[in-house]
């Protein structure tokens, strides 16, 4: 299996945005790569978002996706937006080298993203 590295822990910003780098050790010269972000919480795994991209090009997520990303060589910089405290969990980066064959699959150990909902602003007296 292909090795995929990602940070162990990331803290989302107060605006509910978390970014992390997913890096894969490519055993071949892939031209088309698929990156999937999976969320593991309470032993359940769900797909957060996925994108297919040509090496050297931007990642294209679906229009309604909460993810955006950029690629550089064997690194993918992923950003997940709109996170709330209930979205805290382990976010796993899955990388597939699709074309040309052979196919390679790598799954990272996951990035624990902590999301803290901001305190509501106290009423101001004027």
């Amino acid at each position: 299996a292909m090795h995929v590295a990602q940070p162990a822990v990331v803290l989302a910003s107060s605006r509910g945005i978390a970014s992390f780098v997913c890096e894969y050790a490519s055993p071949g010269k892939a031209t088309e790569v698929r990156v999937t972000v999976l969320r593991q919480a309470d032993s359940q795994v769900t797909e957060v978002c996925a994108a297919t991209y040509m090496m050297g090009n931007e990642l294209t997520f679906l229009d309604d996706s909460i993810c955006t990303g950029t690629s550089s060589g064997n690194q993918v910089n992923l950003t997940i937006q709109g996170l709330r405290a209930m979205d805290t969990g382990l976010y796993i980066c899955k990388v597939e080298l699709m074309y040309p064959p052979p196919y390679y699959l790598g799954i990272g150990n996951g990035t624990q993203i902590y999301v803290i909902d901001p305190e509501p602003c106290p009423d101001s007296d004027f």
Epitope: T31, M98, P101, Y103
Partner: antibody, heavy 118, light 107 residues
Framework: EVQLVESGGGLVKPGGSLRLSCAAS????????MAWVRQAPGKGLEWVSF????????YYADTETGRFTISRDNAKNSLYLQMNSLRAEDTAVYYC???????????WGQGTTVTVSS | DIQMTQSPSSLSASVGDRVTITCRAS??????LNWYQQKPGKTVKLLIY???RLHSGVPSRFSGSGSGTDFTLTISSLQPEDVATYFC?????????FGGGTKVEIK
């Protein structure tokens, strides 16, 4: 039910051109890579070309590079093969196939016959 | 290119017989070996992918085995409807290549 229906085959003179089409139904076309495979009369199967689901990746057999062009229109659920500079050895039944598993072709059309002859 | 050599090119067996078809790749193709069936005058159907996984709807009398360069398709009990030509295909490297085919007939 997955269905692939090829069309566009026929008789053409050497050096001529043809455009094959494949109409897909019964599955989400834009999720799958597609391939063309041909079979000369009384012969085995020969892979011709492949296009990935979003058309990012396109590949051809060496003998077809420069003469054939594979393309797809995901809005129309259609796959195409533009064949130029046709030769007698291109005479074959051309099958459209879905690449639903990495590098295996899980569903095939009935084929369309291309005959190159003067 | 990876060459795929199938044997035998044809065989004749009785209903109920165990039939074995072999496929040899010119280099290691890992588990990217698929088997297809083409009945006379019909289209091609995927039988087995990744060496041994049965495609949906394929009877369990069909099985695949092997590794690296040598692979086998087995029909445990030949049925009249199994009369067809069988092809192996490697998906390890482009161009994807097929074996020459094995024509199976009933005695």
């Amino acid at each position: 039910e997955v269905q692939l229906v090829e069309s566009g085959g026929g008789l053409v003179k050497p050096g001529g051109s043809l455009r094959l089409s494949c109409a897909a139904s019964g599955f989400t076309f834009s999720d799958y890579g597609m391939a063309w495979v041909r079979q000369a009369p009384g012969k085995g199967l020969e892979w011709v070309s492949f296009i990935s689901n979003l058309a990012y990746s396109v590949y051809y057999a060496d003998t077809e590079t420069g003469r054939f062009t594979i393309s797809r229109d995901n809005a129309k659920n259609s796959l195409y093969l533009q064949m130029n500079s046709l030769r007698a050895e291109d005479t074959a039944v051309y099958y459209c196939a879905r690449s639903g598993l990495p590098y295996a072709m899980d569903y095939w059309g009935q084929g369309t016959t291309v005959t190159v002859s003067s | 290119d990876i060459q795929m050599t199938q044997s035998p090119s044809s065989l004749s067996a009785s209903v109920g017989d165990r039939v074995t078809i072999t496929c040899r790749a010119s280099q290691d193709i890992s588990n990217y070996l698929n088997w297809y069936q083409q009945k006379p005058g019909k289209t091609v159907k995927l039988l087995i992918y990744y060496i041994s996984r049965l495609h949906s709807g394929v009877p369990s009398r069909f099985s695949g085995s092997g590794s690296g360069t040598d692979f086998t398709l087995t029909i445990s009990s030949l049925q009249p409807e199994d009369v067809a030509t069988y092809f192996c295909q490697q998906g390890r490297m482009l161009p994807w290549t097929f074996g020459g085919g094995t024509k199976v007939e009933i005695k």
